[in-house]
């Protein structure tokens, strides 16, 4: 009996009610592998999800997030609201980054500007809500024979952002 079921191709299921005949998957269902005893219900892309690929008898539907949202999780299982650069998402909506913090993405959270002085450098370009500061060379970097070693990771002071 098991052998009969294993002959059922993708897009069908092994119908126990009909002497294990291979029956086509009903509408809005699919089987992506052979030998299945049931077909899986197609994923529905609704609400903040939009359809990227329609369901077929052999493959599930694939979803994306609607405009203004971005995907999280495997196969875009979650959608999270976008914000503008210079903002972060809170429960009360998109909030501007606090002074001294920035976010250069449409998702994620604000983080503090680099503290140039912790690396013995000076601020070359001021930071904004959307961009980190640019640190200028320290006096030692400008002296003759100065090392051209790779600078360390940016030093930061702990900051906080609104919620």
């Amino acid at each position: 009996l098991q052998d009969l079921c294993s002959n059922c191709p993708a897009g069908t299921f092994c119908d126990n009610n009909r002497s294990q005949i291979c029956s086509p998957c009903p509408p809005n269902s699919f089987s992506s592998a052979g030998g299945q005893r049931t077909c899986d219900i197609c994923r529905q892309c609704k609400g903040v999800f939009k359809t990227r690929k329609e369901c077929s008898s052999t493959s599930n539907a694939e979803c994306d997030c609607i405009s203004g949202y971005h995907c999280l999780g495997a196969e875009c299982s979650m959608c999270e609201q976008d914000c503008k650069q210079g903002q972060e998402l809170t429960k009360k909506g998109c909030k501007d980054c606090c002074f001294g913090t920035f976010n250069d993405q449409k998702r994620g959270i604000c983080r503090p500007w680099t503290n140039c002085s912790l690396d013995g450098k000076s601020v070359l370009v001021n930071g904004t809500k959307e961009r980190d500061v640019v640190c200028g060379p320290s006096p030692a970097d400008l002296s003759p024979g100065a090392s051209s070693a790779t600078p360390p990771a940016p030093a930061r002071e702990p900051g906080h952002s609104p919620q």
Partner: antibody, heavy 116, light 108 residues
């Protein structure tokens, strides 16, 4: 597809140092936060801290500040968790996870055993 | 930083409704997320942003969050729902994430 693959299990003695890793693939590693989460044997999940690999900005839970160091090398899409001097109480499963609030992808975990 | 308190265990008969609470000062001001963890596995999101269910998570899972309590509700609980459940939140002040202590759900 997105994956976080962690380094293998470690057995260490108290006082030894250790650095475990979490390699991301299938997404823009530099622009997503990576968090580290501890789970002691038979206990719950504890958020340790996070790093933004793009510029290596880190932020620690007060409970773990000064106890561990989180770092990243964006050129090889890898985040690290390290100890300079392990204690028996550091014995736990350590997970890396993508995100800062919603942790949508998790590594398989690295079991760290510290015993004399 | 905010502390999240969960009951250590909850028991429910198959087909009945399980409710797992997560209490913390003004947790309703932040998003609450819920994770399911089965033995030997990494956690999985079952509810995000208070009440949203990821695709692939059964409709019997739902969530709410207001005041000092977030709640995960599992309607028509099934044996496969037996697991540990953790609430979590992210607080922008201090930029910290925190997990609740976890609740072991037993399906009798």
């Amino acid at each position: 597809q997105v994956q976080l693959v962690q380094s293998g299990a470690e057995v260490k003695k108290p006082g030894e140092s250790l650095k475990i890793s979490c390699k991301g693939s299938g997404y823009s590693f530099s622009t997503y936060w990576i968090s580290w989460v501890r789970q002691m044997p038979g206990k719950g999940l504890e958020w340790m801290g996070k790093i933004y690999p793009g510029d290596s900005y880190t932020n620690y839970s007060p409970s773990f500040q000064g106890q561990v160091t989180i770092s990243a090398d964006k050129s090889i899409s890898t985040a690290y968790l390290q100890w300079s001097s392990l204690k028996a109480s550091d014995t736990a499963m350590y997970y890396c996870a993508r995100g800062y609030g919603i942790f949508d992808y998790w590594g398989q975990g690295t079991l760290v055993t510290v015993s004399s | 930083d905010i502390e999240l308190t969960q009951p250590p265990s909850v028991s429910v008969a198959p087909g009945q409704t399980a409710r797992i609470s997560c209490s913390g000062d003004n947790i309703g001001d932040q998003y609450a997320h819920w994770y399911q963890q089965k033995p030997g596995q990494a956690p999985v999101v079952v509810i995000y942003q208070d009440k949203n269910r990821p695709s692939g998570i059964p409709e019997r899972f739902s969530g709410s969050n207001s005041g000092n309590t977030a709640t995960l509700t599992i309607s028509g609980t099934q044996a496969e729902d037996e697991a540990d459940y953790y609430c979590a939140t992210y607080t922008g002040f201090g930029s910290l994430a925190v997990f609740g202590g976890g609740t072991k759900l037993t399906v009798l």
